[in-house]
């Protein structure tokens, strides 16, 4: 399903509030269809999605959202103003960065606004919620003579995260995996010269700020070592101008870039 | 008729398991969090855990996290707590209790009778 | 966590008597404070939410009051069907939602 977001226009129905702030959520003349689950992950502290399955209604509604947090000095009930739609119902909410309070217990309310008592209504840890950007620019480092380091960058969680680096070489069935705290940087010890090696890591708000289960994207892979025959044609000119890069620009000392940033070096 | 119902509860060996169930009638089960709280004999009240309206989000007391599991089913109106690694100290009446909103504050407004476990060697 | 203390812990009183109990908060909750009456068997029932809101069908001689760290519960004249144990629960920094230890009200 596509989805977009828009603004709403302010032609909102307000009879939402009334109900919202003076009605206790349940009571006998209540309707008994259950409301879909309102999902909500922080994309890397900068913006916020709750979406629910809008499809899930019996016929197409526009549920409303509202969210506040538990808060001294503002708890007021906050409306969506960035709806995302599904198919032109409303199918989640986009909050952005100066609406989100990573430490404040926020509840978020859904809300049929045809048969307002028809609302549920939860509390959620946002700092658990987190789910930081893929790990970027992967460099590697030979150390000594079979000695390989890893290095990564995230962008603005650095302290905040845990990581996890898969690498396997061209004759392995299987990813090698090894958790890696948040110093973002992993040596492998023993590298043998005559396999071709792939690196990639993932990033995990946890557990220094937030105990957030959802891991990022996997990085682009990055690779070192020998040519394969079974390897893309293309990718071995790339491997000699990265070779032609670390020997040229970096003193002799070998360094790799990701492929993401070679296709860049390679066409500009 | 607006209630809810605890079954399960019985006498256990520290190490045990046991079940507890919370039947709800009366109210949109559906759209409501539930939660456990459980009372010592002779105590007072004990948070225990939180399952939310559709029960992908759970929470619990640092008391019986990774010991205990909330769940729930909506078609059946039914909420669980599997109590694994039973000790002593899990020796309580539990209730559950349903939350509300009203404005911005929740509050439990309905509680069951409650259901005793007993932890004995 | 946050730390609920209630005062006194328990409470002799007659018929007729103003009681007022109170609860302290171990850090600022503004109005996320409610209390709960139970009686000995039996279980917990809602008395006051947000503090100073009084529950449907609860009489008014129950009230509540204060925000931040401190909060009362009064009860304006008592009745015998009042004596029981008063509880206070926090549902500002939830989840985990604490409770006071318990005000046990007993006939003088």
């Known amino acids: 399903l596509n989805t977009t977001i828009l603004t709403p226009n302010g032609n909102e129905d307000t009879t939402a509030d009334f109900f919202l702030t003076t009605m206790p959520t349940d009571s006998l003349s209540v309707s008994t269809l259950p409301l879909p689950e309102v999902q909500c992950f922080v994309f890397n502290v900068e913006y916020m999605n709750c979406t629910w399955n809008s499809s899930s209604e019996p016929q197409p509604t526009n549920l409303t959202l509202h969210y506040w947090y538990k808060n001294s000095d503002n708890d007021k009930v906050q409306k969506c103003s960035h709806y995302l739609f599904s198919e032109e119902i409303t199918s989640g909410c986009q909050l952005q960065k100066k609406e989100i309070h990573l430490y404040q217990t926020f509840v978020v309310q859904l809300q049929d606004p045809r048969e307002p008592r028809r609302q549920a209504t939860q509390m959620l840890k946002l700092q658990n919620l987190v789910i930081p950007w893929a790990p970027e620019n992967l460099t590697l480092h030979k150390l000594s003579e079979s000695q390989l380091e890893l290095n990564w960058n995230n962008r603005f969680l650095n302290h905040c995260l845990e990581h996890l680096v898969q690498y396997r070489t061209d004759w392995d069935h299987s990813w090698t995996e090894q958790s890696v705290d948040y110093r973002h940087k992993f040596s492998l010890p023993s590298v043998d010269g005559q396999k071709r090696y792939t690196f990639r890591v993932r990033s995990r708000f946890n557990p220094l700020c937030g105990s957030a289960q959802h891991w990022s994207e996997w990085s682009h892979p990055i690779h070192w070592g020998s040519n394969t025959s079974k390897e893309n044609p293309f990718l071995f000119a790339l491997e000699a101008e990265q070779k032609l890069i670390s020997e040229e620009d970096l003193g002799g000392e070998q360094k790799l870039i990701s492929e993401e940033d070679l296709h860049h070096h390679h066409h500009h | 008729q607006v209630q809810l119902v605890e079954s399960g509860g019985g006498v256990v060996k520290p190490g045990g398991s046991l079940r507890l169930s919370c039947a709800a009638s009366g109210f949109t089960f559906s759209n409501s969090g539930i939660h456990w709280v459980r009372q010592a004999p002779g105590k007072g009240l004990e948070w225990v855990a939180l399952?939310?309206?559709?029960?992908?989000?759970?929470y619990y007391a640092d008391s019986v996290k990774g010991r205990f599991t909330i769940s729930r089913d909506n078609s059946k109106n039914t909420l669980s707590l599997q109590m694994n690694s039973l000790r002593a100290e899990d020796t309580a009446v539990y209730y559950c209790?349903?939350?509300?909103?009203?404005?911005?504050?929740?509050?439990?407004?309905?509680w069951g009778r409650g259901t005793m476990v007993t932890v004995s060697s | 966590d946050i730390q609920m203390t209630q005062s006194p812990s328990s409470l002799s009183a007659s018929v007729g008597d103003r009681v007022t109990i109170t609860c302290r908060a171990s850090q600022s909750i503004s109005s996320y404070l409610n209390w709960y009456q139970q009686k000995p068997g039996k279980a917990p029932k809602l008395l006051i939410y947000?503090?100073?809101s009084l529950q449907s069908g609860v009489p008014s001689r129950f009230s509540g009051s204060g925000s931040g760290t401190d909060f009362t519960l009064t009860i304006s004249s008592l009745q015998p069907e009042d004596f029981a144990t008063y509880y206070c629960?926090?549902?500002?920094?939830?989840?985990?939602?604490?409770f006071g230890q318990g005000t046990r009200l007993e006939i003088k």
């Open positions: 947000a503090a100073s």
């Open positions: 399952i939310s309206y559709a029960g992908s989000n759970k």
């Open positions: 209790a349903k939350e509300v909103w009203t404005g911005t504050y929740d509050s439990f407004d309905m």
């Open positions: 629960q926090q549902s500002y920094s939830t989840p985990p939602i604490t």
